[in-house]
Interface confidence: medium
């Protein structure tokens, strides 16, 4: 069950999808992958302020523990809860190939 | 599979599993759990350089943005890869209750 | 007045299987955890398993486990203990008892001998 | 061997105090509340202490617990021929997740 998706820290401010554009250079791709040449990276980013989007109560321990000791635990953090496969054309020694990756691109995100 | 978990930034920076204490009324349930009293509890704390314990492709890419756009995009955050399971004995409104809970305690951590 | 009465207890022999039963009376059964604690001749208490109120959660000791299984019937008002692929070292007295952690009420208990 | 260790036996004369020590670790008695069970010569455990130092009703206040760290207590005052028993404690164990006992302490009023 999804804690809170209101955002007291502001609109768009708090753990969310963000949508980064990146191309096989920015990537280090360049040397083995052909298609795409640009990819849409989709990414967690944002604050976990108290109870937003707890994946889970190791998340809601974070935040209790992070309040009273912020210098030894850090905030629980944006990290996807489930993501979007992408295939990529890949260059091989024969020619080329098809790979799909299941854990390339964010497609939802929760605090942990 | 493990990326490299020697730590570049010195022993114990990076990320690993840490213990911190936390008694019932640091946790806010104090209301609710008769037992444990006090939990040790086990979460995922430290920094996450490049390529160190990435969980994934996803982390991968992040590493490799956050080091073209570090004001846009963070650096992969330390989170839990896999959880223990505890039992917490809870207060209920006629007595008292068994609970598994295995999302609790972190096992063992990555950088995603 | 709360009562807990064991029965199912007896000689059995070395892998052989016995279910013991736990009639309960006196309260409202359904809302509390039970546990079964066992004592050899002689010896000390040892906890055997618990069940939650509703049996949806179910703990064991590690020299029990997948052995026996504990179970309830709330309409019933009665707790189970079946037991398997028995071994000497299981013979002993077998109480139940209210509750997870302070066991408030106990049967007389049972005695379950297992030799050949 | 008990995950919760009580001393084998303990003595007193009537009307003296004696206390039974519990010794535990950070996964039991270090995070949890101790109970204590008085057993009688042929009968079934008895609650005696729980939550570490209550008493339920109906056992005198003769009986009291206590606990300190990894450690629990039980001390008896005024004690009398009645008190002769076994006792033990127990507690949840957070590490087993299941409930551990104390070997047993034989009390003989001498």
């Known amino acids: 069950a999804r804690n809170g998706d209101h955002c007291p820290l502001g609109p768009g401010r708090c753990c969310r999808l963000h949508t980064v554009r990146a191309s096989l250079e920015d990537l280090g791709w360049a040397d083995w992958v052909l298609s795409p040449r640009e990819v849409q990276v989709t990414m967690c980013i944002g604050a976990c302020p108290s109870q937003f989007r707890a994946a889970n109560m190791h998340a809601q321990i974070k935040t209790s523990l992070h309040r009273l000791k912020p210098d030894t635990v850090p905030a629980p953090c944006c990290v996807p809860a489930s993501y979007n496969p992408m295939v990529l054309i890949q260059k091989t020694d024969t020619g080329v190939s098809l790979q799909t990756y299941d854990d390339l691109l964010a497609k939802d995100c929760h605090c942990i | 599979a493990r990326n490299g978990d020697h730590c570049p930034l010195g022993p114990g920076r990076c990320c690993r599993l840490h213990t911190v204490r936390a008694s019932l009324e640091d946790l806010g349930w104090a209301d609710w759990v008769l037992s444990p009293r006090e939990v040790q509890v086990t979460m995922c704390i430290g920094a996450c350089p490049s390529q160190f314990r990435a969980a994934n492709m996803h982390a991968q890419i992040k590493t490799s943005l956050h080091r073209l756009k570090p004001d846009t995009v963070p650096a992969p955050c330390c989170v839990p890869a896999s959880y223990n399971p505890m039992v917490l004995i809870q207060k209920t409104d006629t007595g008292v209750s068994l609970q598994t809970y295995d999302d609790l305690l972190a096992k063992d951590c990555h950088c995603i | 007045e709360v009562q807990l009465l064991e029965s199912g207890g007896g000689l059995v022999q070395p892998g052989g299987s016995l279910r013991l039963s736990c009639a309960a009376s006196?309260?409202?059964?359904?809302?509390?955890?039970m546990s079964w604690v066992r004592q050899a001749p002689g010896k000390g208490l040892e906890w055997v398993s618990v069940i939650s109120h509703d049996g949806s959660s179910k703990y064991y000791a590690d020299s029990v486990k997948g052995r026996f299984t504990i179970s309830r019937d709330n309409s019933k008002n009665t707790l189970y203990l079946q037991m398997n692929s028995l071994r000497a070292e299981d013979t002993a007295v077998y109480y139940c008892?209210?509750?997870?952690?302070?066991?408030?009420?106990w049967g007389q208990g049972t005695l379950v001998t297992v030799s050949s | 061997q008990s995950v919760l260790t009580q001393p084998p036996s303990a003595s007193g004369t009537p009307g003296q105090r004696v206390t039974i020590s519990c010794s535990g670790s950070s996964s039991n008695i270090g995070s949890n509340y101790v109970t204590w069970y008085q057993q009688l010569p042929g009968t079934a455990p008895k609650l005696l202490i729980y939550d570490s130092s209550q008493r339920p009703s109906g056992v005198p206040d003769r009986f009291s617990g206590s606990k300190s760290g990894t450690s629990a207590s039980l001390a008896i005052s005024g004690l009398r021929s009645e008190d002769e028993a076994d006792y033990y404690c127990?507690?949840?164990?957070?590490?087993?997740?299941?409930?551990?006992f104390g070997g047993g302490t034989k009390l003989t009023v001498l």
């Open positions: 127990g507690t949840w164990d957070s590490s087993l997740s299941g409930y551990v």
């Open positions: 006196g309260f409202t059964f359904s809302d509390y955890a």
């Open positions: 008892a209210r509750g997870p952690i302070n066991f408030d009420y």
